[in-house]
Interface confidence: low
């Protein structure tokens, strides 16, 4: 339904707390480098006009579209060009070519400090001191810094990190209380960014299509007893919520999930039994709470697949129908028989049934060439099976640091051209599958494996497209959205790869690295590893082994010392020439 | 209202060290965080380092880990920078700011106070 003024329609269905919310992550989305007092002063402007629109839907500018609206007042900018060189151009397009302008500039990598956390006395001041200003800082440094972070789950973010300040800042022991909070926070609020920058990939690099296919495999494994009309409808609107936030829409998209959380709970009865206590709860948590619900009780005795889809004669007169809807009736009916997939695995089925249709209903006899079409399947299915087998059996025997260390080097043997912040950063971040997935039973290990690994690997897909080194990582990042993790996992070692010179400036320690916590060491040593590989590629893992066992007696030894600079200096020395003499550098 | 007064620049060959100083009057030091940003010619001002109330948290931006040591003397009101190992990268206007309220200490906007700056130049 058509409003006279759009801006007056969003501030009125969001309230003006939500409204100025979305509206500043909106706008640090965007210039992700601009001080955060000119954001609040622009979002206070818009909120003003809005509030003017809200009062007469015929004032002047009120029916200008939002894109128009925050693209004016973007522009407005004074330092634009200089702080963002070229994306000052956008500014000369007319919407949508414009929007799309500011799309484009978004940077996954974008060149900010580390946030650093204060002491805890600190924080609460200024949290009491303004409690308003405290949350929007908040808002603002997470936006910018993840420029496609799913902007209504950020409010539901921000609101939890105001309860924890609330509840702490009260405590008698206010660290011991909020610090464990922070931490939850800052982890999930990582997590949540990739898995939101994955679909966004998704629809942007792959098209509606793509996405719509991933999410009706998730919705029919989180709601197999649903019909398939059911799926459909909730695909439909699920994919027009992710495409508005992706696309930085974020007043569409926060009002339209809010409408779709409401629709869900008012017909729970035919979607899922598991959705009582989320549709109990407040907007933002029932919606976050919907997205994370468990998976329902498959409907007892589903019949065979093979009738429909293999046995009947008519299957290639449906197929010929409505292709998307009988390959989309297929995933539907995979899907929630199989909960033990990953949503990846299942797509590759729905892909190879697709193929084998597409071959086999323009043959002579169409149903002998499709009748063992399910047997394809079996090595697809064999495929992570195996591999989650074996990478399991590794973790348990390593544990999750020596884990990554085995990807780091196995990644970076397969794409050493990738830079090493990188290699470091998403090899971590695969090693994290062990502790979060292998502590499963078969049953739910490849659905948590496999969807995981694809969320990370789309973080390296991401980096790596901002500054292109590799064209192995192109080609598997951009030829099959659902083949990316098998198809870096047949990666061998690159043949073509000319060693980096050695430079020691590379492997030189300061005390430094004594008073840094246990995770910023790792990285540090993880970092050092991966230079080794690229320096000595066709390095033995006893070789690398013996090199980090070295390295790791070092730190210690030299963070005991009286004189740690001065041990640093001189025994690093050594530790560079023993190590060199031990790689034949 | 913090007067916050830097000094100690200068010009110093590569490799060769500098000790900043900030002065701080007109309200209570140890009741501020204290930060060192520097900006080159033509560059954005930068994080360099903080360090809170009581010097129970110092941080430091990479570039400079393992060169450069804040330290604070609430006694004296007096914040310093001890820049070692310099660098011509290190060439820059460096300025003392002052927080009293932080959420984040890399971020320049939580400062509220700002000194002069004093002119550091490493070349050879």
């Known amino acids: 339904d058509a409003h006279k003024s759009e801006v007056a329609h969003r501030f009125k269905d969001l309230g003006e707390e939500n409204f100025k919310a979305l509206v500043l992550i909106a706008f640090a989305q965007y210039l992700q480098q601009c001080p955060f007092e000119d954001h609040v002063k622009l979002v206070n402007e818009v909120t003003e006009f809005a509030k003017t629109c809200v009062a007469d839907e015929s004032a002047e500018n009120c029916d200008k579209s939002l894109h128009t609206l925050f693209g004016d007042k973007l522009c407005t900018v004074a330092t634009l060009r200089e702080t963002y060189g070229e994306m000052a151009d956008c500014c000369a397009k007319q919407e949508p070519e414009r929007n799309e302008c500011f799309l484009q500039h978004k940077d996954d990598n974008p060149n900010l400090p580390r946030l650093v956390r204060p002491e805890v006395d600190v924080m609460c001041t200024a949290f009491h001191d303004n409690e308003e200003t405290f949350l929007k800082k908040y808002l603002y440094e997470i936006a910018r810094r993840h420029p496609y972070f799913y902007a209504p789950e950020l409010l539901f973010f921000a609101k939890r990190y105001k309860a924890a300040f609330t509840e702490c800042c009260q405590a008698a022991d206010k660290a011991a209380c909020l610090l464990p909070k922070l931490d939850e926070l800052r982890d999930e609020g990582k997590a949540s960014s990739a898995k939101q920058r994955l679909k966004c990939a998704s629809l942007q690099k792959f098209g509606e299509r793509a996405f719509k296919a991933w999410a009706v495999a998730r919705l029919s494994q989180r709601f197999p007893k649903a019909e398939f009309a059911e799926v459909s409808k909730l695909v439909t609107d699920l994919t027009k919520v992710h495409t508005e936030c992706c696309h930085g829409d974020l007043l569409e998209c926060a009002d339209d999930r809010a409408d779709l959380a409401k629709y869900i709970c008012e017909n729970q009865d035919s979607i899922s039994s598991k959705l009582k206590e989320c549709c109990e709860k407040p907007l933002l948590e029932k919606s976050h709470c919907i997205a994370e619900v468990e998976n329902d009780e498959m409907p007892a005795d589903l019949p065979s697949l093979a009738a429909d889809f293999v046995e009947s004669k008519d299957v290639c007169k449906n197929y010929a129908e409505a292709k998307d809807v009988f390959l989309g009736m297929f995933l539907y009916e995979y899907a929630r028989r199989h909960p033990d997939y990953s949503v990846v695995l299942l797509l590759r089925l729905a892909k190879t049934y697709e193929t084998t249709l597409e071959k086999c209903c323009a043959a002579a006899d169409p149903h002998e060439c499709y009748a063992k079409v399910f047997d394809e399947f079996k090595p697809l299915v064999e495929e992570p099976q195996n591999l989650i087998k074996q990478n399991c059996e590794l973790f348990e025997q390593l544990g999750e640091y020596k884990f990554q260390n085995a990807l780091l080097v196995r990644y970076t043997k397969k794409v050493p051209q990738v830079s090493t912040p990188t290699l470091v950063e998403v090899s971590r971040n695969l090693g994290k599958v062990g502790s979060k997935c292998c502590k499963h039973p078969e049953a739910k290990r490849m659905p948590c494996a496999e969807d995981y690994l694809s969320v990370v690997l789309n973080q390296l897909c991401v980096l790596h497209e901002k500054t292109p080194v590799s064209d192995r990582v192109t080609k598997c990042c951009t030829e099959s959205l659902v083949n990316r993790r098998p198809c870096f996992s047949a990666l061998e070692v690159d043949e073509t790869y000319v060693p980096k010179e050695f430079n020691a400036e590379t492997f030189t320690f300061h005390a430094d690295i004594c008073t840094l916590s246990e995770k910023e060491r790792q990285i540090k040593k993880q970092t050092a590893l991966v230079e080794l590989v690229k320096h000595k590629p066709k390095a033995t893992k006893e070789q690398l082994k013996a090199v980090m066992d070295d390295f790791a007696a070092f730190v210690e030894k030299c963070c005991k010392a009286d004189d740690k600079e001065t041990c640093f200096a001189e025994e690093g020395k050594k530790l560079v020439a023993a190590s060199q003499a031990a790689l034949g550098l | 209202e913090v007067q916050l007064v830097e000094s100690g620049g200068g010009v110093v060959q590569p490799g060769g060290s500098l000790r900043l100083s900030c002065a701080a009057s007109?309200?209570?030091?140890?009741?501020?965080?204290m930060g060192w940003f520097r900006q080159a010619p033509g560059k954005e001002r930068e994080f360099v380092s903080a360090?809170?109330?009581?010097?129970?948290?110092?941080y430091y931006a990479d570039s400079v880990k393992g060169r450069f040591t804040i330290s604070r003397d609430n006694s004296k009101n007096t914040v310093y920078l001890q820049l070692n190992s310099l660098r011509p990268e290190d060439t820059a206007l460096y300025y003392c700011?002052?927080?009293?309220?932080?959420?984040?200490?890399?971020?320049?906007?939580?400062?509220?106070?700002w000194g002069q700056g004093t002119l550091v130049t490493v070349s050879s």
């Open positions: 360090i809170s109330q009581n010097s129970i948290h110092t």
């Open positions: 007109g309200g209570t030091f140890s009741t501020y965080v």
């Open positions: 700011a002052a927080s009293r309220f932080t959420s984040w200490y890399t971020a320049d906007y939580e400062y509220d106070y």
